[in-house]
């Protein structure tokens, strides 16, 4: 029987800068029941606080609700593991909520094949930002990325969409069923998970063009830029 091993706080994430959760890995098992407690203080203060909510984030977690979350303040946190033989302490983790945002995936991804009479057909997609993110305040700039592939293909084709919530792509394989997904990230922070896949059947009469792909730079009404296949591969495939 031993004291518990040193725990490690390995991740903190916020969906929207209003709340956040941190998770730790327990240390090695000393062979006895072990209690974990997370304590924190705000940088520049000496008063230590205990985790307000050990439940919401699941096992080995601490959730900070709205009333405990401050923007523009750095949190300094540590996990203490204790059993009958003694205690161990994690390294301290410094957390600034601004830099740990991981939004929910974008919502309402709609995909359509557009076949205008006067232009080449294209795949058009549209989505909404995640509901928890308030874009009106200016606190957030969300960037989007789209990926698509034929249903049976192994490789995804990835496109960076910038801040726009609409996108169109030419040059798809006629007659194929495509999977399309979108994800987002704030300017400082982490990519969301991919949205659930949306399926779209490309008609057999869809005109294939291997030489170039048309990608909107702003919204659909804005300027459009012709990008060569080589440039596209360099800039947009991850």
């Amino acid at each position: 029987q031993l004291p518990p091993g040193k725990p490690e706080i390995f991740k903190c994430r916020s969906p929207n800068k209003e709340t956040f959760t941190c998770w730790w890995r327990p240390g090695t098992d000393g062979g006895l029941p072990t209690n974990y407690s997370l304590t924190y203080h705000r940088e520049g203060e000496t008063l230590m606080h205990e985790c307000p909510d050990y439940i919401t984030g699941g096992p080995n977690s601490c959730h900070f609700g709205k009333q405990y979350t401050s923007m523009w303040r750095t949190y300094v946190m540590m996990v203490n593991a204790t059993n009958q033989m003694g205690s161990s302490f994690s390294d301290e983790l410094y957390v600034d909520v601004t830099y740990i945002v991981q939004p929910d995936p974008p919502l309402e991804l709609t995909v359509e094949v557009k076949q205008p009479e006067d232009r080449k057909p294209y795949l058009w997609m549209k989505w909404s930002p995640p509901t928890l993110i308030d874009l009106k305040t200016g606190w957030f700039t969300l960037l989007y990325e789209i990926r698509l592939k034929p249903e049976k293909a192994a490789e995804w084709e990835t496109h960076f969409a910038g801040q726009q919530t609409e996108f169109k792509i030419l040059s798809l394989h006629p007659g194929q069923k495509y999977l399309v997904q979108v994800r987002c990230k704030p300017d400082h922070g982490y990519w969301s998970a991919w949205s659930p896949a949306t399926f779209i059947q490309i008609p057999s009469d869809f005109i294939m063009n291997d030489e170039q792909k048309l990608i909107s730079e702003e919204d659909l009404g804005g300027e459009q830029k012709l990008i060569s296949e080589e440039d596209l591969h360099h800039h947009h495939h991850h």
Partner: antibody, heavy 120, light 107 residues
């Protein structure tokens, strides 16, 4: 520049007491845990005791438990080791060492040591 | 307490040699292991922490690896300044323990 300077060592008879001090400079003392490590002549390193930044947790090696007491005075940037009931096997060079964090990590700075000799 | 066992106790080597020192822990210590170098009459100096992270200012010929119970310190090309005694230390538990040391001497 981080500096740790130990003092208080000397020749003492078995059963008697001695108090070691470590004066710290060049860093914010109360941002770090501190430790005492000893080395008997010609032998390896042995962790003696440690204390976290706010004195909220203290630990001792098995060979000194109940006889030695570690303490710190953050205002004076000083670490202490009160050694009671000294034995011949406590003869060693005693180093003051800084933990690299406030709680439990490796030792990133060491003093040059103060020699304690327990002999009749 | 967790026991740390180093091997070999003494190692004879020449300048330019690749040198490996092993440290075994009696219990799993994750990656919470540090390596120190000590020269005669001097205080120890940290080389490696968290099993494989090089302390700032330490030459890149020193490297550490391992996790769990088995760890190694490697000196890729031994320099004259490297003849010293090396200690491993676990900090998985608050009660720290050191290995007994490995003396690297000139062959």
């Amino acid at each position: 520049e981080v500096q740790l300077v130990e003092s208080g060592g000397g020749l003492v008879q078995p059963g008697r007491s001695l108090r070691l001090s470590c004066a710290a400079s060049g860093f914010t003392f109360d941002d770090y845990a501190m430790h005492w490590v000893r080395q008997a002549p010609g032998k390896g390193l042995e962790w003696v005791s440690g204390i976290i930044w706010n004195s909220g947790h203290i630990g001792y090696g098995d060979s000194v438990k109940g006889r030695f007491t570690i303490s710190r005075d953050n205002a004076k940037k000083s670490l202490y080791l009160q050694m009671n009931s000294l034995r011949a096997e406590d003869t060693a060079l005693y180093y003051c060492a800084r933990d690299s964090g406030r709680y439990q990590s490796y030792f990133d700075y060491w003093g040059q040591g103060t020699l304690v000799t327990v002999s009749s | 307490d967790i026991q740390m066992t180093q091997s070999p106790s003494t190692l004879s080597a020449s300048v330019g040699d690749r040198v490996t020192i092993t440290c075994r822990a009696s219990h799993i210590i994750s990656s919470w292991l540090a390596w120190y170098q000590q020269k005669p009459g001097k205080a120890p100096k940290v080389l490696i922490f968290k099993a494989s992270s090089l302390e700032s200012g330490v030459p890149s010929r020193f490297s550490g690896s391992g996790s769990g119970t088995e760890f190694t310190l490697t000196i890729s090309s031994l320099q004259p300044d490297d003849f010293a005694t090396y200690y491993c230390q676990q900090y998985n538990t608050y009660s720290r323990t050191f290995g007994q040391g490995t003396k690297v001497e000139i062959k």
